[in-house]
C-alpha cells in the first residue's frame, strides 16, 4: 500500500512525450523530475496521460515550457510529497514559462519538506490565490509567485460548490483574508486539523500516525501512510532505520548488500561522477567525511590516526590550481600522484585558503610548477611538502619550475623547512622579486645543486625589477567568429633561437580603445588580463616558409571588443643583453550571433479586434538588433469561459485599465499621478531608496534565477545510442 510501485531514478524528460511513459510504474522518484522544452505538444496529447502511482519526489519538480499542458490534475493526481533533499536554486517546485498551464491541480500535494516554490511567467495560470502554501511548506516567505495570470486579478477562480452558492472547501486566513482553498474548480485543497501537523489526516479529519507525511488511508497506523515523515522500511514508516539497516538518501532503509552493490557497481564502472558508497553513522553515503578513511573489507568509514593518509590520483597526471575552488578539490590530500601546476592570479585571503586546502600535501610524485601566480608572495602554504619525486618531469627535465611570478618573494623558510627533490632540475625565470640567494638556498637544501644547466636559472630575470622588449611584433592574421578569434603574428627569433621560450598572449574585454598593458595589475596579484602561454613554433631554415606563431582564442562573448597584445618570453644571453619583442595593443571585435529571447512580453487588448504587444530587449543582444519577429496563432476558445456565470458574487472584474503600452514610462507615471490626484486628491509618493534597492535586488535575483535555469536545462545534445535510453537534448 505504501509506495506501491517502483523507486525510479531522477528523470529529465524533454522535447517530446516519449520518455514520459517511464514514469508509469514509479511511486517514488529518487532524485528530481524535470519536464521541459516540449514545443510541439498539444492539449490532446495529455488527455489520456496519467501517473496515479507517483506519490513522492525526493528532490524537486521542475516544469518549463511544456506547451499544451493545461493542468497537472490528471498527470500527477496522487503526488503527495516533494522532499526537496536537493533543490533547484533553493526551490522544490518550479513552474516557469508554462504558456498553456491554467491551474496547478496537484490536489493531493500535502507536503514540501524542504525548499520553497517558484511559479513565474505562466501567463494563463490561475488558481494560485486559492492555495494556502503554509499548509504545504514551512518557508512560505521564500516562495516566489509572480508574473502569472493570477497577478492581474483576471482569473475569477471558482472553488467547488461556489457556482451553486455553496462553500465546499475549507477556508483559511492568509494576510488577514479568509479565503476558500482549492486547486481547481472541482478539487478542494485538503486542510487537516492543526494538531495533525504535517502528518496528514483521513477524509474524516482524523490524524495520521506521527511517522506519516501528508496523508494516510487509516489513522494512527504507520503501515497505512501514503508517504513517510522519516524513513520507509518494509511497508511501514519508521523514525530511524534499525540494525541491520542503513539510512539511504534521507528517506528509506537499505541493507548492507544494497549499499555494497552500489559501491561495486561504481568501482567497476568507467562512468565518471558515480559514487563508491560507504557506510558511516548508520548511513549509506557517497563518500567518507573528512577525517575518515574507508575500511575496504566492510565499507565502514574509520577515523584516521592523525591526518588521513589520502593519495590523490590526478586525472591525466596533472592538475592546475588556478583558484581556491580548484585547490579545494585537493583538500586533505597527503600524497599527490601526479604533478601540480599552480597558477593563482588573485583571490581573497589566499595564503590561508591555500594552506587549508594544500597544506597537508607531503609528497608530489611528478613535478611542481609555479606559473604566473601573481598573487603568491611565498610557497609556505605547502606547509608539509617534504618530497618532490620527479617521476614525471616538465619538458626540459624539470621537477620544480617557477615562471613569471611577479610577487613571489620567498620559497620556504629554509631554516625550518626541508625539501628533497629526488630527480629533475630546477627552472627559475621571470620572478622579479625572488632573490637569487633564495634560489641557491633551495638548490642546497633540495639536493639539486650541480644538476642545473646554464640557462635553467636566469641571472637577470630573478630578483630584478625590470625587463624590456626592444622589437615590435606585428600581427599577420586576424579572423573572428561570434565566439572565437584566430590570431597569428610574425615570427620572432632572438640571435640564439634557443633563447625563445615562447609567447604570452594577453587579452581582455575592452569596450573602449584606451587600454594599457598595466591596467588592473597590482602588488596583490590582481590582473585584469587573461594570459595564455604559447610554445614557440617549429623553426625552419627557409625564411620564406617560416611558420607564423598563433593562437585560437575560444569561448569569447559575441559582439564584444577585446584588447589583445602578445610578447615574447626569452632567456638572457651571455652578453647580458636583453632580447625580446612585444606587439602593440590591438582591438578586435567578435562577430554577432543570435540574440537571447526578448524579455517580459506583455499583451494588452485595447479593442475587440486588436492586441498590442510590448516587450523588453533581450539581456544578451549579441549584436545590433535591427528587428523583431512576432508570431501569433489563433487558439481554440476555452469551454470553461462559457460555462462561468460572470454575475456570481466574488468574481473580480479585470482591474487593469488599458493604457498604450508604448508610452514612455515617464509619461505613464505622469498620467497615473494625475488620475490619482483627481480621484483621490493625492499623488503617488516617490519611491524610497529602500524600495528602489529592493526592486533592483529583485530584478537581479530574477535574472540570476533565469541564468541558472538556462544553464541547467540547456545542455549539449547527447548522441542517440539506439536504445532510446538517452534523450536528444537541445544545445
Amino acid at each position: 500500500h505504501l509506495y506501491p510501485g517502483e523507486v525510479c531514478p531522477g528523470m529529465d524528460i524533454r522535447n517530446n512525450l516519449t520518455r514520459l511513459h517511464e514514469l508509469e510504474n514509479c511511486s517514488v522518484i529518487e532524485g528530481h523530475l524535470q519536464i521541459l522544452l516540449m514545443f510541439k505538444t498539444r492539449p490532446e496529447d495529455f488527455r489520456d496521460l496519467s501517473f496515479p502511482k507517483l506519490i513522492m519526489i525526493t528532490d524537486y519538480l521542475l516544469l518549463f515550457r511544456v506547451y499544451g499542458l493545461e493542468s497537472l490534475k490528471d498527470l500527477f493526481p496522487n503526488l503527495t510529497v516533494i522532499r526537496g533533499s536537493r533543490l533547484f536554486f533553493n526551490y522544490a517546485l518550479v513552474i516557469f514559462e508554462m504558456v498553456h498551464l491554467k491551474e496547478l491541480g496537484l490536489y493531493n500535494l500535502m507536503n514540501i519538506t524542504r525548499g520553497s516554490v517558484r511559479i513565474e511567467k505562466n501567463n494563463e495560470l490561475c488558481y494560485l490565490a486559492t492555495i494556502d502554501w503554509s499548509r504545504i511548506l514551512d518557508s512560505v516567505e521564500d516562495n516566489y509567485i509572480v508574473l502569472n495570470k493570477d497577478d492581474n486579478e483576471e482569473c475569477g477562480d471558482i472553488c467547488p460548490g461556489t457556482a451553486k452558492g455553496k462553500t465546499n472547501c475549507p477556508a483559511t486566513v492568509i494576510n488577514g483574508q479568509f479565503v476558500e482553498r482549492c486547486w481547481t474548480h472541482s478539487h478542494c485543497q485538503k486542510v487537516c486539523p492543526t494538531i495533525c501537523k504535517s502528518h496528514g489526516c483521513t477524509a474524516e479529519g482524523l490524524c495520521c500516525h506521527s511517522e506519516c507525511l501528508g496523508n494516510c488511508s487509516q489513522p494512527d497506523d504507520p503501515t497505512k501512510c501514503v508517504a513517510c515523515r522519516n524513513f520507509y522500511l518494509d511497508g511501514r514508516c519508521v523514525e530511524t532505520c534499525p540494525p541491520p539497516y542503513y539510512h539511504f538518501q534521507d528517506w528509506r532503509c537499505v541493507n548492507f548488500s544494497f549499499c555494497q552493490d552500489l559501491h561495486h557497481k561504481c568501482k567497476n564502472s568507467r562512468r565518471q561522477g558515480c559514487h563508491q558508497y560507504v557506510i558511516h553513522n548508520n548511513k549509506c553515503i557517497p563518500e567518507c567525511p573528512s577525517g575518515y578513511t574507508m575500511n575496504s573489507s566492510n565499507l565502514l568509514c574509520t577515523p584516521c590516526l592523525g591526518p588521513c593518509p589520502k593519495v590523490c590520483h590526478l586525472l591525466e597526471g596533472e592538475k592546475t590550481i588556478d583558484s581556491v575552488t580548484s585547490a579545494q578539490e585537493l583538500r586533505g590530500c597527503t600524497v599527490i600522484n601526479g604533478s601540480l601546476i599552480i597558477n593563482i592570479r588573485g583571490g581573497n585571503n589566499l595564503a590561508a585558503e591555500l594552506e587549508a586546502n594544500l597544506g597537508l600535501i607531503e609528497e608530489i610524485s611528478g613535478y611542481l610548477k609555479i606559473r604566473r601566480s601573481y598573487a603568491l608572495v611565498s610557497l609556505s602554504f605547502f606547509r608539509k611538502l617534504r618530497l618532490i619525486r620527479g617521476e614525471t618531469l616538465e619538458i626540459g627535465n624539470y621537477s620544480f619550475y617557477a615562471l613569471d611570478n611577479q610577487n613571489l618573494r620567498q620559497l620556504w623558510d629554509w631554516s625550518k623547512h626541508n625539501l628533497t627533490i629526488t630527480q629533475g632540475k630546477l627552472f627559475f625565470h621571470y620572478n622579479p622579486k625572488l632573490c637569487l640567494s633564495e634560489i641557491h638556498k633551495m638548490e642546497e637544501v633540495s639536493g639539486t645543486k650541480g644538476r642545473q644547466e646554464r640557462n635553467d636559472i636566469a641571472l637577470k630575470t630573478n630578483g630584478d625589477q625590470a625587463s624590456c622588449e626592444n622589437e615590435l611584433l606585428k600581427f599577420s592574421y586576424i579572423r573572428t567568429s561570434f565566439d572565437k578569434i584566430l590570431l597569428r603574428w610574425e615570427p620572432y627569433w632572438p640571435p640564439d633561437f634557443r633563447d625563445l621560450l615562447g609567447f604570452m598572449l594577453f587579452y581582455k574585454e575592452a569596450p573602449y580603445q584606451n587600454v594599457t598593458e598595466f591596467d588592473g595589475q597590482d602588488a596583490c596579484g590582481s590582473n585584469s588580463w587573461t594570459v595564455v602561454d604559447i610554445d614557440p613554433p617549429l623553426r625552419s631554415n627557409d625564411p620564406k616558409s617560416q611558420n607564423h606563431p598563433g593562437w585560437l582564442m575560444r569561448g569569447l562573448k559575441p559582439w564584444t571588443q577585446y584588447a589583445i597584445f602578445v610578447k615574447t618570453l626569452v632567456t638572457f644571453s651571455d652578453e647580458r643583453r636583453t632580447y625580446g619583442a612585444k606587439s602593440d595593443i590591438i582591438y578586435v571585435q567578435t562577430d554577432a550571433t543570435n540574440p537571447s529571447v526578448p524579455l517580459d512580453p506583455i499583451s494588452v487588448s485595447n479593442s475587440s479586434s486588436q492586441i498590442i504587444l510590448k516587450w523588453k530587449p533581450p539581456s544578451d543582444p549579441n549584436g545590433n538588433i535591427t528587428h523583431y519577429l512576432v508570431f501569433w496563432e489563433r487558439q481554440a476558445e476555452d469551454s470553461e469561459l462559457f460555462e462561468l456565470d460572470y454575475c456570481l458574487k466574488g468574481l473580480k472584474l479585470p482591474s487593469r485599465t488599458w493604457s498604450p503600452p508604448f508610452e514612455s514610462e515617464d509619461s505613464q507615471k505622469h498620467n497615473q499621478s494625475e488620475y490619482e490626484d483627481s480621484a483621490g486628491e493625492c499623488c503617488s509618493c516617490p519611491k524610497t531608496d529602500s524600495q528602489i534597492l529592493k526592486e533592483l535586488e529583485e530584478s537581479s535575483f530574477r535574472k540570476t534565477f533565469e541564468d541558472y535555469l538556462h544553464n541547467v536545462v540547456f545542455v549539449p545534445r547527447k548522441t542517440s545510442s539506439g536504445t532510446g535510453a538517452e534523450d536528444p537534448r537541445p544545445s
Epitope: Y477, I478, R479, G550
Partner: antibody
Framework: EVQLLESGGGLVQPGGSLRLSCAAS????????MSWVRQAPGKGLEWVAV????????DYAHSVKGRFTISRDNSKNTLYLQMNSLRAEDTAVYYC???????????WGQGTLVTVSS | QSVLTQPPSASGTPGQRVTISCSGS????????VNWYQQLPGTAPKLLIY???KRPSGVPDRFSGSKSGTSASLAISGLRSEDEADYYC???????????FGGGTKLTVL
C-alpha cells in the same frame, strides 16, 4: 541571384604561372571572407587559400604556401589567385567559394580547370 | 589522405534511409561545427547542411545532420534517384588552423 564565376584556367607547363579570377554578384562582396578550393580529377575537395573581407589577412594550405597568392579587388567584386611555380599535382578544377563560419562553401562558383602538363 | 574520414561509397534503394558518417578528431569535429556538401556529377559542390544540423533554404528536410563527439553523420530519408551524388563533410581544424574536408562518399541509388 548570388553568383560566383571563375575564369582564367587552362593548360600550363610545370614551373609556369597562371592567374585565376572569380567575379562575384548578387551579394555584398566586401562583407565576406573568400576562399579558393580545388578538386583534382576523381579526387576530393582541398582547401587552397583564404582572404579576409578587406584583403589584409591571407592564409594558405601548406601545399601551396610561397607559390600561390590570393588577392581581391572589392571595387570590382573580384577575387584572384595568382599561381606560380606550378606543378603537375596542382592539376585540378579550382572553385572560388564564399566562407561561412570559417569554412568555405555556402556559395560556390562553377569551377575552372587548370592542367599542369608538359 | 583526408583529415576527415568518410566511407568511399554508400548505396540504397528509393524510399530508403541512408546515413553517411564523417569521423575526425578533437581538434576538428570535436570542437567545431560541421558542414555537408552535395556534388552532383559534373557540377560544383552545394551546401547541404551547416552548423552540424541546419539546412539552408531550399534544401529538403529529407536531409538531416548530426554530430556526436568527434564524429558527424548525414542522414537522407526517402531516398530519390536525384540524390545520387558525392557527399563531403568539412570542419575547421584548430591544430591545422584551417578548414579540412572529408574524402567524399559516392552515394548510389540502386
Amino acid at each position: 541571384e548570388v553568383q560566383l564565376l571563375e575564369s582564367g584556367g587552362g593548360l600550363v607547363q610545370p614551373g609556369g604561372s597562371l592567374r585565376l579570377s572569380c567575379a562575384a554578384s548578387g551579394f555584398t562582396f566586401s562583407s565576406y571572407w573568400m576562399s579558393w578550393v580545388r578538386q583534382a580529377p576523381g579526387k576530393g575537395l582541398e582547401w587552397v587559400a583564404v582572404i579576409s573581407k578587406d584583403g589584409s589577412s591571407t592564409d594558405y594550405a601548406h601545399s601551396v604556401k610561397g607559390r600561390f597568392t590570393i588577392s581581391r579587388d572589392n571595387s570590382k567584386n573580384t577575387l584572384y589567385l595568382q599561381m606560380n611555380s606550378l606543378r603537375a599535382e596542382d592539376t585540378a578544377v579550382y572553385y572560388c567559394a564564399r566562407d561561412r563560419d570559417w569554412i568555405p562553401g555556402d556559395v560556390w562558383g562553377q569551377g575552372t580547370l587548370v592542367t599542369v602538363s608538359s | 589522405q583526408s583529415v576527415l574520414t568518410q566511407p568511399p561509397s554508400a548505396s540504397g534503394t528509393p524510399g530508403q534511409r541512408v546515413t553517411i558518417s564523417c569521423s575526425g578528431s578533437s581538434s576538428n569535429i570535436g570542437s567545431n561545427s560541421v558542414n555537408w556538401y552535395q556534388q552532383l556529377p559534373g557540377t560544383a559542390p552545394k551546401l547541404l547542411i551547416y552548423d552540424n544540423n541546419k539546412r539552408p533554404s531550399g534544401v529538403p528536410d529529407r536531409f538531416s545532420g548530426s554530430k556526436s563527439g568527434t564524429s558527424a553523420s548525414l542522414a537522407i530519408s526517402g531516398l530519390r534517384s536525384e540524390d545520387e551524388a558525392d557527399y563531403y563533410c568539412a570542419a575547421w581544424d584548430d591544430s591545422l588552423s584551417g578548414p579540412v574536408f572529408g574524402g567524399g562518399t559516392k552515394l548510389t541509388v540502386l
